[in-house]
């Protein structure tokens, strides 16, 4: 166990051209605060992934008002360290994210507004118990100077805070097998580190690396409850048996406790023992309150002011997560209808609609025929966001303005010849065929294949069908 400590030295414009504008103004005074997020290992994880080693918020800095005409100076900082307690071993390699937040103190409806000014990230190697490490990181035109260290909490010592120490029993030397506990030379190392993952509730050790179980528990990490309900009666060759161990799946399998919490099984379910700074059924809630301003991106904090009461962040549109820290890809919900193109502008969502559609979400189907005339007696037909003209005989084109050649499509079957006519077209049929398009054969006996002759006509009469 131990504490990671972060000291912010300065936050202000970086060197070089393009100095940033001051984040505060006479009309909108503001103050800064910082958030640090730690993850074990040299991970390349996204900013939204959990801060598995822990996270902390600083206090608010002094209120700052820009002096008109003056360049942006280093901004006034909060007092004190940011401290992230860690329960287990210090991993030695870690990733960090440090965010600089601005709290605007103008006449905001519903309280102050928060916005992210800068975010820096890095991956470092660090031994616990070492000196302060200094660092400079740049984010755009801003520069952040800070120091950090990891220190162990007694009785833990060592570069990973896994060694325990005890006072020397004799002034000159440690007991058998025990080394001096550098740098505490007056103490001796206590080699009582159990097997990794050994259940704190059901296991213990007297030798390094062992895990001995509470009676009623079994398994290499003492996480499996012993059941004797399915035991066979001790008969025959196994008469020396007094019972059997039937490991059943436990509610702690897979460790449901987050943030380094340890799981213990209860008669009905499980209970998480949470590290300092976390609480909740699964240690999913950090011990911050609304007074700490844990809701980012303008989220509204609701909850008690005492450490035992949780808070809930009500996020503004476009953000989600327990602290409103995640930007929602609002276009992934496909809010634009009728094939509209979605644009997430951050402060708002826009839909670029296809022709024939309108509205914030392209939900309105425009009257495609409104104000559109089809020439030469054509009629307008709506559909698919575009208008179409159904043209009168003899005309074609989008607006029926083109005179159509009715014979272009060769409409007369069986070698009939096509003639353009004011009312459309006329087919002169080849011998043996009849009909408007010469589609019906004439039988040799003079009977046609027509199912019935039109009224007033006898089958076999020479005719034209128009």
């Amino acid at each position: 166990a131990g504490v990671f400590e972060l000291q912010i030295h300065s936050f202000g414009p970086g060197p070089g051209p393009g100095a940033p504008r001051s984040p505060c103004s006479a009309r909108l005074p503001c103050r800064l605060f910082f958030r640090v997020c730690l993850k074990p290992g040299l991970s390349e994880e996204a900013a939204e992934s959990p801060c598995a080693l822990g996270a902390a918020l600083s206090a608010r800095g002094p209120v700052y008002t820009e002096q008109p005409g003056a360049p942006a100076p280093d901004l006034p900082l909060p007092d004190g360290l940011l401290q992230v307690p860690f329960r287990d071993a210090w991993p030695g390699t870690f990733s960090f994210i440090i965010e600089t937040w601005r709290e605007e103190l103008g006449d905001q409806i519903g309280g102050p507004a928060w916005s992210l000014l800068a975010r820096v990230a890095g991956r470092r190697r660090l031994a616990a118990g070492g000196p302060w490490a200094r660092d400079i990181q740049r984010a755009g035109a801003w520069e952040l100077r800070f120091s950090y260290r990891a220190r162990c909490e007694p009785p833990a010592v060592g570069t990973a805070c896994t060694r325990l120490c005890r006072p020397r029993s004799a002034p000159s030397r440690c007991g058998p097998g025990l080394r001096p506990c550098a740098p505490l030379e007056d103490e001796c190392e206590a080699p009582l580190v159990c097997r990794a993952g050994c259940s704190p509730e059901h296991g213990f050790c007297e030798q390094p690396g062992e895990c001995r179980c509470l009676e009623g528990w079994t398994g290499p990490l003492c996480t499996v409850p012993v059941s004797t309900s399915s035991c066979l009666s001790p008969r025959g060759p196994s008469s020396a048996t007094t019972g059997c161990l039937v490991p059943g799946p436990g509610p702690c399998d897979g460790n449901p406790c987050a943030n380094g919490g340890s799981c213990s099984e209860t008669p009905r379910s499980f209970e998480c023992t949470c590290p300092r700074g976390f609480y909740g059924l699964r240690c999913e809630v950090s011990g911050v309150t609304c007074a700490d301003g844990p809701c980012f991106n303008g989220g509204l904090c609701v909850g008690g002011a005492d450490p035992d009461s949780a808070y809930i962040c009500h996020c503004p549109p476009g953000f989600q997560g327990s602290n409103c820290e995640k930007r929602v890809d609002r276009c992934s919900l496909q809010p634009c209808r009728n094939g509209g193109l979605c644009l997430d502008l951050g402060h708002a969502l826009r839909c670029r609609c296809r022709a024939g559609f309108a509205g914030p979400r392209c939900e309105h189907d425009l009257d495609d025929c409104a104000g559109r005339a089809c020439a030469n007696g054509g009629t307008c037909v709506e559909g698919g966001g575009a208008h179409r003209c159904s043209c009168a005989l003899g005309f074609g084109g989008r607006d029926c303005r083109e005179r159509a050649d009715p014979c272009a499509a060769r409409p007369c079957a069986h070698g009939g010849r096509c003639y353009a006519h004011f009312s459309g077209l006329v087919c002169a049929c080849a011998p043996g065929y009849m009909g408007a398009r010469c589609e019906f054969p004439v039988h040799p006996d003079g009977a046609s294949a027509l199912p019935a002759a039109p009224p007033g006509l006898r089958p076999g009469d020479p005719q034209r069908y128009l």
Partner: nanobody, 117 residues
Amino acid sequence: QVQLVESGGGSVQPGGSLRLSCAASGIVFNSDVMGWYRQVPGKPRELVATITGGGSTNYATSVKGRFTISRDNAKNTVYLQMNSLRPEDTAVYYCNGRRGDSMLAFWAQGTQVTVSS
């Protein structure tokens, strides 16, 4: 430095009761799992009962229903109330805890509990 001091042991007849106390100094243990252990000469030490920071308890099968573990985080103290004591409960009782994968402290002197008629 971390120190755990057990007290409250003594001699008692079968069926009697004792209350053991363990006071911790040099550490704030309110988030640590604390436990009572016992050892009979010539046998390995065994875990008797544990209590989490939130007050959830676990007991060895042999003491369930007879022993009760509790803690007072404000006083940095953990207790073991032992009722209906049996001769097989005779042992040296120790207090210790767990923090992460480590034991919280070195084993202290312990307190002797003797149950005999």
